[in-house]
Amino acid sequence: QLTTESMPFNVAEGKEVLLLVHNLPQQLFGYSWYKGERVDGNRQIVGYAIGTQQATPGPANSGRETIYPNASLLIQNVTQNDTGFYTLQVIKSDLVNEEATGQFHVYPELPKPSISSNNSNPVEDKDAMAFTCEPETQDTTYLWWINNQSLPVSPRLQLSNGNRTLTLLSVTRNDTGPYECEIQNPVSANRSDPVTLNVTYGPDTPTISPPDSSYLSGANLNLSCHSASNPSPQYSWRINGIPQQHTQVLFIAKITPNNNGTYACFVSNLATGRNNSIVKSITVSALSPVVAKPQIKASKTTVTGDKDSVNLTCSTNDTGISIRWFFKNQSLPSSERMKLSQGNITLSINPVKREDAGTYWCEVFNPISKNQSDPIMLNVNYNALPQENLINVDLEVLFQGPGSGLNDIFEAQKIEWHEARAHHHHHH
C-alpha cells in the first residue's frame, strides 16, 4: 500500500517539510504531486519521468518544491498557505495508477506576547482588573502565570475570550503579581515580560508607637503613627479633638499633666478616597519634687577576694526614677565583673577582687530631683593563711644560718601565725 508521511507534521512558518513516500511500487513510469486531496491537473506541483529523470513543474509549483527520485517532495520556506493535503500519483508500467494523500500544518513562529490591562491603579476591594494577552492569533493556546506559578483555583479569577483575557473580580493588595502570559502553538511558545500590578489600598487602621500610655512629667513624648497604605497616606494629629501638625511623628518636649488627653492619628489616602484613624490615651504623672534618700542593702560586706561574689541593692520607694551607682567617685560598672540588673537596682560583682574594696553608694534621680544613699563599705580579704599542705614547711631552716639574727623574730612570728590559724578555724 502506497503511503506518504509528512516530516514534520507540524511545521514552523519559514522552515521546510519533507513529504516522504513509503511502499513505492517497483515498475514505474513516473509520478506527480498535486496540491489537495485528489489528482487535478490545474493543481499539479511537479511531475517526474523516471526514464529521463526529468522533473517538470506544474501550474501549482512555487519554485520552493524539490522532487527526489524516490518520489519524496521537499517544500522549503513554507507559509501558512501551504497548510493542507498533498496527493501523490504514481504511474506504473502496467498503466495502472496508484495514489496516496498526506498532509501537514504550517504554524507561525509566535512573537513575544505583551499584556494590556484596563486599569493601571486598581483600588483594593473595589475595582476589577482585566489583563489581555496580545496579540490575538489563530490556533494559539493562551496560558497565564502569577508569581511564576500557574493560575490557582479561585472564584476571583476568571478566564475568557479563549483564555486570552484574565479577570480579577475584586483586587486585593496581595494581587500585585507579577503576571505573565504565554502563547503556545505546536511549533513554538513565548512568554511575555512580567507585569506587576500597582494596587492602591488603605489606609488600614493606623498604629501609634510606642504603645505606652503612661508617662512621667518631664519626659519627651514622641509618638509615631503608621498605616499600611498605597500610596503612602497623609498623616495628621489631633489632641483632645484639636487639629495639630500634618506629620507622621508628633513630638512634645517635657510633657506635664497638662498634656493628658486623647491623641488621635488621622490617615487619608487620596488615591482610594479612604480615611482611617486611631486614638491613644496619654496620661502624665506628676513627678515628686523631692526624691527620698535611697538605701543600699548588701548580700555581704566582707568577702573573700577571687572567690566570693556580692550583690548590692539600691532600695527606694519612689517611682519614675533612674538609678546610678558610684565607687570611689567613679560611675559603675567599671569592669566586666560588674553587672547592673533590674533597671540598675542591683549591682553584682562576680568575682570580687582586691581592687573592689572600698566605698559604694547609689543615687536615685528624676528630671527635677535627686538623692544619694549613705555609702557602704565593702571589705575584701585575701586568705593570708597557708594551705594545709604548706603549714609544715620548716621556715626555721630558711632563716637559720651563721650570724643570722632572724631566729628570735621568726619564733615570735610563728606564734602569731598559729594563733591566727586557730582563730580562723574557730570562726569557720
Epitope: N240, G241, T283
Partner: antibody, heavy 121, light 108 residues
Framework: QVQLVQSGSELKKPGASVKVSCKAS????????MSWVRQAPGQGLEWMGW????????TYVEEFKGRFVFSLDTSVSTAYLQISSLKAEDTAVYYC??????????????WGQGTTVTVSS | DIQMTQSPSSLSASVGDRVTITCKAS??????VAWYQQKPGKAPKLLIY???YRKRGVPSRFSGSGSGTDFTLTISSLQPEDFATYYC??????????FGQGTKLEIK
C-alpha cells in the same frame, strides 16, 4: 438610630463579682469609644473612664483602678464592665455612654438605659 | 481635681419661663463643657457640647454659653417636658472628667 442597651439589674453579695453588658447598634461600634459612668443612689454622675473600641485599651479614673475592668466583644458590638470584690458602696446605677474620642469635643452623646447594681448581704 | 459647682441646686419655674442654670469650674476648662438632662429613672441625655453647640435633634430653646470657668445653660421658654435634673460636665482634665452636682428644675 443609635442605641445602647444594657443588661438588667443585679443583686449581689459583698465580695462577689458582677459583669454589666452594653450592646451597641445603629453605628460602627469600633469608630467610637465607650465610657462608663456611675450614679450612686441620690447622687450625681461620676465618670469612671473609657475603653478604646478599636484597640481595647482601657483608661480608668484613679478611683476606679483595680476592681473595675472594661472589656469588649467587638464581634457582637458589646462593651462590658466587670466589678470584682463588690462592696456596699458599689451600689449604684452604671451607665455606658458613647464618646467620640477622636472628635473629643462632642462629649457623651448617647447613653444606655443604665444597670442597677445592688450590693447587700 | 476640677470641681464643677452648679447653681442653683434646685429651682421652680413655670411653663413659658426663661430659665438660666450656671456652672462654675474651679479652674479654667476652655470650652470643654457639656450639659445633660436627666429625668427620674432614665439615662442622661446630651443637650449641649463644647459649651455652646446644640446636639442635633435638641430643641432650639436650649442654648449654652461660656468659656474658661463660667458656663450657662439657658432654656428660653420652658415646656412641660423640660422639668428634669440638669448636669454640667467638664471634659477638659483628661482623664478625670467631672460633673456638677445637678440642678433640679421643678414645676412652680
Amino acid at each position: 438610630q443609635v442605641q445602647l442597651v444594657q443588661s438588667g439589674s443585679e443583686l449581689k453579695k459583698p465580695g462577689a463579682s458582677v459583669k454589666v453588658s452594653c450592646k451597641a447598634s445603629g453605628y460602627t461600634f469600633t469608630e467610637f469609644g465607650m465610657s462608663w459612668v456611675r450614679q450612686a443612689p441620690g447622687q450625681g454622675l461620676e465618670w469612671m473612664g473609657w475603653i478604646n473600641t478599636k484597640t481595647g485599651e482601657a483608661t480608668y479614673v484613679e478611683e476606679f483602678k483595680g476592681r473595675f475592668v472594661f472589656s469588649l466583644d467587638t464581634s457582637v458590638s458589646t462593651a462590658y464592665l466587670q466589678i470584682s470584690s463588690l462592696k456596699a458602696e458599689d451600689t449604684a446605677v452604671y451607665y455606658c455612654a458613647r464618646w467620640d474620642a477622636f472628635e473629643y469635643v462632642k462629649a457623651l452623646d448617647y447613653w444606655g438605659q443604665g444597670t442597677t447594681v445592688t450590693v447587700s448581704s | 481635681d476640677i470641681q464643677m459647682t452648679q447653681s442653683p441646686s434646685s429651682l421652680s419655674a413655670s411653663v413659658g419661663d426663661r430659665v438660666t442654670i450656671t456652672c462654675k469650674a474651679s479652674a479654667a476648662v476652655g470650652t470643654y463643657v457639656a450639659w445633660y438632662q436627666q429625668k427620674p429613672g432614665k439615662a442622661p441625655k446630651l443637650l449641649i457640647y463644647s459649651a455652646s453647640y446644640r446636639k442635633r435633634g435638641v430643641p432650639s430653646r436650649f442654648s449654652g454659653s461660656g468659656s474658661g470657668t463660667d458656663f450657662t445653660l439657658t432654656i428660653s421658654s420652658l415646656q412641660p417636658e423640660d422639668f428634669a435634673t440638669y448636669y454640667c460636665h467638664q471634659y477638659y482634665t483628661y482623664p478625670l472628667f467631672t460633673f456638677g452636682q445637678g440642678t433640679k428644675l421643678e414645676i412652680k
